[in-house]
């Protein structure tokens, strides 16, 4: 199957930036997302740190370490509440991500 | 809102130890670590070391020995630092580290004079 | 030593020129993109502009590209303004465990004609 220009392939993702013009002059913001083309039963989400396709359920039940967010040798845990997650790098430092 | 507050700067004689506090508020220090940096006056910034909880603090190869960096409280991070010299003065800041620095506390300043 | 290399130290630019800002580390950085760059502006504390190489921090300006990976990164500033006048600075981020976890550029300041 051949994929159109610009189209993804199916359980895919890219980063996309959207600049959206501000009516006030200078106030330009530039806002980085991902665009996924994911399969029935996933949604996107967050695999090695990088946007990807997820199963569904992980994100329904909140169990977001399920999706092995964090990058190899990193630990995962899930904030208090299940608001999100940190990844512990070997050494000690926390990058915590919160899910709004 | 997020929010650091550095305090306990002032002027001090070489050789004293001095411990300032960093105070957190709208985030919490379970979830973040958080990085003291100083700045020299006319210099540029210099990272003195980083804690995050339940992990030993970690120290730039300078400063290691001379400051100790704790969690002292739900909301509050102290740096103690022992043996001041006039090389110390500086304005001192706090910032939470996560995926880069932000927010950053407004500094408190520490003058080392005799 | 970890060391991250700033050029230029200083660097002019007119209105609307565009401005180019070099940081080269002794060593990768974690994960070869964890590098931020911040503005500073004299009595201010430091302001987040782009993390992780080339994220632009929240209500920053699209004027401002980071770009780079490994121990090479670069910070771009288009259509330059008469408020970008500032002290910028690059900052690495590094294994805790084999070495200082972070450590800054030197600065570069920016002047406008």
């Known amino acids: 199957q051949f994929l159109k220009e610009g189209q993804l392939a199916a359980g895919t993702c890219e980063i996309v930036t959207l600049d959206r013009d501000s009516s006030q002059p200078r106030i330009e913001e530039r806002s980085q997302t991902a665009r996924c083309a994911c399969r029935k039963g996933q949604i996107a989400g967050t695999t090695r740190a990088r946007p990807a396709c997820v199963d569904a359920r992980i994100i329904k039940t909140k169990q977001w370490c399920d999706m092995l967010p964090c990058l190899e040798g990193e630990g995962c845990d899930l904030l208090i509440n299940r608001s999100g997650w940190t990844c512990t790098q070997p050494g000690g430092r926390i990058k915590t991500t919160t899910v709004s | 809102q997020e929010q650091l507050v550095e305090s306990g700067g002032r002027l001090v004689t070489p050789g004293t130890t001095l411990t300032l506090t960093c105070t957190v508020s709208?985030?919490?220090?379970?979830?973040?670590?958080v990085s003291w940096v100083r700045q020299a006056p006319g210099k540029g910034l210099e990272w003195i070391g980083y804690i995050a909880n339940n992990y030993n603090p970690h120290y730039a190869s300078w400063a290691k020995g001379r400051f100790t960096i704790s969690k002292t409280s739900s909301t509050t991070v102290d740096l103690k630092m022992t043996s001041l010299t006039t090389e110390d003065t500086a304005t001192y800041f706090c910032?939470?580290?996560?995926?880069?620095?932000?927010?950053w506390g407004p500094g408190t300043l520490v003058t080392v004079s005799s | 030593e970890l060391d991250l290399t700033q050029t230029p130290s200083s660097v002019s630019a007119a209105v609307g020129g565009t401005v180019t800002i070099n940081c080269q580390a002794s060593?990768?950085?974690?994960?070869?993109?964890?590098l931020a760059w911040y503005q500073q502006k004299p009595g201010q504390p430091p302001k987040l502009l782009i993390y992780a190489a080339s994220t632009l921090a929240s209500g920053v300006s699209s004027r401002f590209k980071g770009s780079g990976s490994g121990t090479q990164f670069t910070l771009t500033i288009s259509d330059v303004q008469c408020d970008d006048a500032a002290t910028y600075y690059c900052?690495?981020?590094?294994?805790?465990?084999?070495?200082?976890?972070?450590?800054f550029g030197g600065g570069t300041e920016l002047e406008i004609l």
């Open positions: 900052q690495g981020e590094f294994s805790c465990s084999s070495a200082d976890c972070n450590a």
């Open positions: 910032a939470r580290d996560n995926y880069g620095m932000d927010p």
């Open positions: 709208g985030f919490s220090l379970s979830s973040y670590g």
């Open positions: 060593q990768s950085v974690y994960n070869n993109k964890n």
